[in-house]
C-alpha cells in the first residue's frame, strides 16, 4: 500500500498555522465561463488571468472578457480589464507571452464582422500597460515571437499572407502571400512553405520551402515538392514527394537548408506520417508510421548528422497524424524516455529507455505494489504509465507524467501494475532515480506538482465532488500531510504553479456554485514557512545517476560519461530556494562498442555488439545508397552515438570501405544507376 499519514510522517510540526497564515483566497466577480492563466516572465510573480463568458444569442454570440493581473504569484489579483478597453479577447489565440524575461504580452481581440483587420493589445512592461493596435490583416494564428529578438513577430493571416513586425507589433508588413506554415529558426531566420496553384491542401506535396534571413527583404527557395517541414534541435527536416509515386521521404539539413541529405529512413505513403518525437543539438527521435491504420509505427534514432538511423523501438503507439503518443522525455535524468507500445494482442505496455533509445525495457514493478488480477504471473509484472493516450481515451487520468530538470531523478505518473495498461482507476507512482525504481505514492488519481526544485510535492485528489484538502510531502513523496485550505469546498479545476518548479507558491483554481450563480475562485498557498530555513551543505547527499551495479567498473556510464549529483536528503526540511542550481560532477568513461552505432551499410546481429557489413542492400537502404550523397557512403562501419563523450578504451578502427559499388541492382534501370550522387 501507499505511504500513510501516520506519526512517522509528521515531519513538519505546526504546519496548519504556518499554512493558514499563507493561504490567500481571491474570488473573481464574474460569471464562470472559461479561464486561462499565463505567467509573465521568470521569477517576476506576475500572472495574467483571462476569463471569458459566452452567451449564445439568436443571431450571434455575445462574449465578455475580463483580465486580471497579480504581481505576487497569485495571492492578490487586480481587475485590469479597462487597460484593454473592455474588449472581448479571442481565447483561441491565448495570451502570447514573450520569450525569456522580455515582459512582452500580446492579446488578440475579437472585432466586428466588417472590419479591415484584427486588433491586438500589446504590453512590454509585464502587463502594467497595454497599447491598442489595429492590424492590416485578420490573424489566423497566434503572434509568434522570434526566440532571438522579442521585438520581431510573425503571424499568418486568414488570407494566407505571412506578416512580420520588427517593432513588437506596432507596424506590420506582408512579406509573402500564399503561405501555409511559417516558423522561426535560429538567428531570426524564417522558414515557410508556399503554394503555387490552389491552396495549402490542394498543393500538399507540391509546396515550396522558402527561407528569409533578413525578415523578408530577400528570399531563397530551399526545397520543392514539399509535403511538410519541421525544426528540431539544429536539424531542419522536410518530407519530400518522390518523383515516381505518391510516397515521400525525409530530407535533412544542418545548414539552414543550403544543402540537403536524404535521411536513411523508410519512405511513407499518403496515409502514413513522420513525426519528430524529440530532438536536441546531437540527435533526433523520429517516428515512422506503419502502413495501414495500425495505430503504431517504429521509432528510429539518428546519428549526429541526422542522416543514418538505427531502429530503436518497434510497434510504437501513435494514433493517426496529429494523434496521441505517450512518448515522454524524462527531463529529470539525462537519456531517459518513456513511451508505449501496442502489443500483438492489442494491449498497451509501457517501455523505458535509459540510454537515449539504445535499449528499451519494461518498468520495474514497484516494491510496495501487487500485480493486478489480470496479470498472468502474480510475481512478474511491470508498472505501466498513463500518458497522453490514456487521457485522450477519457480514462480517469487527470495528468500526464511529470518531471523537472531541477528536481533531479524525480518522475511522477499515474500507472497500473500488471501485464499491460489497465482501464481500472490508476494510482500515482513516483521514481526518485529517473525511472529505474518506482514506489506507489498515492492511492487513486491525483493532480500533482513539484515545488522548490523537489523540496515539496503537492497533490490534490481527482474527484467529481467539491474538495477543500491539499496534500503535501517534503520527502519526495514518501510521507504525506494534509491541509484543509478552505471551510467551503470548491469544484476543483486545476493546480497552477510557476513553470520551472522553483516557486514555493501553488494556486488551486475552481469555482463555487450557489443557487443562481457560479464564480471563479483561487486559493494561493505559500509554503515558505513550511521550509523555514535555507538548505546547507549538510542537507545534501551525493548520488550517482544510472547506477545499477557498483561492482561494475563503469557503473553509471551512459553515453560515455557518468554524473554524480548533490541531492537533497529526504529527511531535510529546508528551502532549495529560487536560485538553486543543480550541482553535478561528470566523469568520462572508457569507450566500449556500446558507445558506437552502426553506420550505413552495417548492422548488429542479435546479441552481438560488433557492426557487420550488410551482405546486400534492400528497400530504403538501397534507395539511400542510390540517392544519398557520395561522402555518406564511405565508412568504417562505426559512428559514435550522438552526445557520447567516452574516451580511450575500445576504438573500433577498421578499413574504410566505399559502399558505392554496392549501389547497383538488376532491378534498377541503367539511367537510374548513373544518377547515384546528387
Amino acid at each position: 500500500s501507499a505511504p500513510g499519514e501516520d506519526e512517522e510522517c509528521g515531519r513538519v510540526r505546526d504546519f496548519v498555522a504556518k499554512l493558514a497564515n499563507n493561504t490567500h483566497q481571491h474570488v473573481f466577480d464574474d460569471l464562470r465561463g472559461s479561464v486561462s492563466l499565463s505567467w509573465v516572465g521568470d521569477s517576476t510573480g506576475v500572472i495574467l488571468v483571462l476569463t471569458t463568458f459566452h452567451v449564445p444569442l439568436v443571431i450571434m454570440t455575445f462574449g465578455q472578457s475580463k483580465l486580471y493581473r497579480s504581481e505576487d504569484y497569485g495571492k492578490n489579483f487586480k481587475d485590469i480589464t479597462d487597460l484593454i478597453n473592455n474588449t472581448f479577447i479571442r481565447t483561441e489565440f491565448g495570451m502570447a507571452i514573450g520569450p525569456e524575461n522580455s515582459g512582452k504580452v500580446v492579446l488578440t481581440a475579437e472585432v466586428s464582422g466588417g472590419s479591415r483587420g484584427g486588433r491586438i493589445f500589446r504590453s512590454s512592461d509585464f502587463a502594467k500597460n497595454f497599447v491598442q493596435t489595429d492590424l492590416p490583416f485578420h490573424p489566423l494564428t497566434q503572434m509568434m515571437y522570434s526566440p532571438q529578438n522579442s521585438d520581431y513577430l510573425l503571424a499568418l493571416s486568414t488570407e494566407n499572407g505571412l506578416w512580420v513586425s520588427k517593432n513588437f507589433g506596432g507596424k506590420w508588413e506582408e512579406i509573402h502571400k500564399a503561405v501555409c506554415l511559417a516558423k522561426w529558426g535560429s538567428d531570426n531566420t524564417i522558414f515557410f512553405t508556399t503554394y503555387a496553384n490552389g491552396s495549402c491542401k490542394a498543393d500538399l506535396g507540391a509546396l515550396e520551402l522558402w527561407r528569409t534571413s533578413d525578415l523578408g527583404k530577400s528570399f531563397k527557395t530551399i526545397g520543392v515538392k514539399i509535403y511538410s517541414f519541421g525544426l528540431g534541435g539544429r536539424f531542419l527536416f522536410a518530407s519530400v514527394m518522390a518523383d515516381k509515386d505518391t510516397t515521400r521521404r525525409i530530407h535533412v539539413s544542418t545548414d539552414q537548408g543550403d544543402t540537403w541529405s536524404m535521411a536513411q529512413l523508410p519512405s511513407v505513403g499518403q496515409e502514413q506520417f513522420y513525426s519528430i518525437l524529440a530532438a536536441n543539438d546531437d540527435m533526433v527521435f523520429m517516428h515512422v508510421d506503419e502502413p495501414g491504420d495500425t495505430g503504431f509505427g517504429t521509432i528510429f534514432t539518428s546519428d549526429d548528422r541526422g542522416i543514418v538511423y538505427s531502429k530503436s523501438l518497434d510497434r510504437h503507439l501513435y494514433t493517426t497524424t496529429g494523434g496521441e503518443t505517450d512518448f515522454t522525455n524524462v527531463t529529470s535524468l539525462r537519456g531517459v524516455y518513456i513511451t508505449s507500445v501496442l502489443s500483438e494482442d492489442n494491449s498497451i505496455q509501457t517501455m523505458i529507455t535509459f540510454d537515449q533509445g539504445g535499449r528499451w525495457t519494461h518498468l520495474r514493478k514497484p516494491e510496495n505494489s501487487e500485480c493486478d488480477a489480470a496479470a498472468k504471473n502474480k510475481n512478474e509484472c511491470s508498472l505501466h504509465i498513463h500518458a497522453s493516450y490514456s487521457i485522450s481515451q477519457k480514462l480517469n487520468v487527470p495528468m500526464a507524467p511529470l518531471s523537472e530538470p531541477n528536481a533531479v531523478g524525480i518522475v511522477i505518473a499515474h500507472g497500473s501494475v500488471g501485464d499491460a495498461i489497465s482501464v481500472m482507476v490508476p494510482d500515482v507512482y513516483i521514481s526518485d532515480d529517473g525511472g529505474y525504481s518506482w514506489t506507489k505514492m498515492l492511492e487513486g488519481p491525483h493532480y500533482y506538482t513539484i515545488l522548490d526544485s523537489g523540496g515539496i510535492i503537492v497533490a490534490i485528489e481527482h474527484s467529481s465532488r467539491p474538495i477543500n484538502v491539499i496534500k503535501f510531502s517534503t520527502d519526495e513523496g514518501q510521507c504525506w500531510q494534509t491541509y484543509t485550505f478552505t471551510r467551503d469546498p470548491i469544484y476543483f479545476t486545476g493546480l497552477a504553479s510557476e513553470p520551472g518548479a522553483r516557486s514555493m507558491n501553488i494556486s488551486i483554481w475552481g469555482f463555487t456554485e450557489s443557487f443562481l450563480t457560479s464564480q471563479w475562485v483561487s486559493y494561493t498557498i505559500d509554503f515558505k514557512d513550511i521550509l523555514e530555513r535555507n538548505c546547507e551543505e549538510k542537507d545534501y547527499t551525493i548520488w550517482l545517476a544510472h547506477s545499477t551495479d557498483p561492482e561494475d567498473y563503469e557503473d553509471g556510464c551512459i553515453l560515455g560519461y557518468k554524473e554524480q549529483f548533490l541531492r537533497l536528503r529526504k529527511s531535510s526540511v529546508c528551502q532549495n530556494g529560487r536560485d538553486y542550481v543543480v550541482t553535478k560532477q561528470p566523469s568520462i568513461c572508457l569507450c566500449s562498442l556500446e558507445d558506437f552505432l552502426c553506420d550505413f551499410g552495417y548492422y548488429r546481429p542479435e546479441n552481438d555488439s560488433k557492426c557487420v557489413e550488410q551482405p546486400e542492400l534492400k528497400g530504403h537502404d538501397l534507395e539511400f545508397c542510390l540517392y544519398g550523397r557520395e561522402e555518406h557512403l564511405t565508412t568504417n562501419g562505426y559512428r559514435k552515438i550522438p552526445g557520447d563523450k567516452c574516451q580511450g578504451g575500445v576504438n573500433p578502427v577498421r578499413e574504410v570501405k566505399d559502399l558505392k559499388k554496392k549501389c547497383t541492382s538488376n532491378f534498377l534501370s541503367p539511367e537510374k544507376q548513373n544518377s547515384k550522387s546528387n
Partner: antibody, heavy 124, light 106 residues
Framework: QVQLVQSGAEVKKPGSSVKVSCKAS????????ISWVRQAPGQGLEWMGG????????NYAQKFQGRVTITADESTSTAYMELSSLRSEDTAVYYC?????????????????WGQGTTVTVSS | DIQMTQSPSTLSASVGDRVTITCRAS??????LAWYQQKPGKAPKLLIY???SLESGVPSRFSGSGSGTEFTLTISSLQPDDFATYYC????????FGGGTKVEIK
C-alpha cells in the same frame, strides 16, 4: 573479496598532523564511498567524513570541518585521512570503511568492509 | 546533526535469551539506519542495513525493524558469540552513531 589495509600506528606531538592511508584491493574502489571513523579508548564510534574516489567529492562531520582532509588516489586505490592541529583528545583508533551501496546513493547502506584500524597516539 | 540515542547502554543476558536494543533518532530518518557489532580490539561488523535488511553472511537470528525515528535490533536467541557492543548508525544526515549497547553475560 574486498579488503582495506591501513597504514601502521603513529605517535604524534600536539599541534602536528597525521596522515593515515587505506589501500583497497579486490574490488571496484572508485565506485564506493570511503568513510573514516574513529574510536577513542573506551568510547563509541565517531564519523569524521568520507570521500567518493570518482570526482573526489569529500564531505566532513561538522566537528572536524577545517581540521580534517580526506583524499583519494584512484590509480592506487588508496584513500587518505589527514588530521591537523592534533590534541591529546585525538588519541584514538582510526578506521577506514567502505560504504555499501545498492543504489546511486553512496552513504545510505551502512559500512560493509572495514580496515583493521590505525592507532594514533597524541602525546607530548 | 541528527542525534542517535541508544538504549540500554548495558544489557545483561543469558545464552538463548531474546534481546532487544532500541535506537531513537532526533528526527525522522526514514529507513536509513544500520546496526553494527563490535568486539574488543576489532573493527565493527555490519549486521543490518536499511533498518531491516540483513547483511549477507549474518545469522538470521539478527533482525531489525522500525522506520522514521524508532528502531530496534533483535537477537532472537542469544549465542555465546553475540556478547559484544552494538551500535546503530543513521545515514540520512551526516552520519552519526548511537552511543552503543554492551551486551554482557548475566
Amino acid at each position: 573479496q574486498v579488503q582495506l589495509v591501513q597504514s601502521g600506528a603513529e605517535v604524534k606531538k600536539p599541534g602536528s598532523s597525521v596522515k593515515v592511508s587505506c589501500k583497497a584491493s579486490g574490488g571496484t574502489f572508485r565506485n564506493y564511498a570511503i568513510s573514516w571513523v574513529r574510536q577513542a579508548p573506551g568510547q563509541g564510534l565517531e564519523w569524521m567524513g568520507g570521500i567518493i574516489p570518482i570526482g573526489g567529492w569529500a564531505n566532513y562531520a561538522q566537528k572536524f570541518q577545517g581540521r580534517v582532509t580526506i583524499t583519494a588516489d584512484e590509480s592506487t586505490s588508496t584513500a587518505y585521512m589527514e588530521l591537523s592541529s592534533l590534541r591529546s583528545e585525538d588519541t584514538a583508533v582510526y578506521y577506514c570503511a567502505r560504504q555499501g551501496r545498492k543504489t546511486g546513493y553512496y552513504y545510505y547502506y551502512g559500512m560493509d568492509v572495514w580496515g583493521q584500524g590505525t592507532t594514533v597516539t597524541v602525546s607530548s | 546533526d541528527i542525534q542517535m540515542t541508544q538504549s540500554p547502554s548495558t544489557l545483561s543476558a543469558s545464552v538463548g535469551d531474546r534481546v532487544t536494543i532500541t535506537c531513537r533518532a532526533s528526527q525522522s530518518i526514514s529507513s536509513w539506519l544500520a546496526w553494527y557489532q563490535q568486539k574488543p580490539g576489532k573493527a565493527p561488523k555490519l549486521l543490518i542495513y536499511k533498518a531491516s535488511s540483513l547483511e549477507s553472511g549474518v545469522p538470521s537470528r539478527f533482525s531489525g525493524s522500525g522506520s522514521g525515528t524508532e528502531f530496534t535490533l533483535t537477537i532472537s536467541s542469544l549465542q555465546p558469540d553475540d556478547f559484544a557492543t552494538y551500535y546503530c548508525q543513521q545515514a540520512d544526515g551526516h552520519i552519526t552513531f548511537g552511543g552503543g549497547t554492551k551486551v554482557e553475560i548475566k
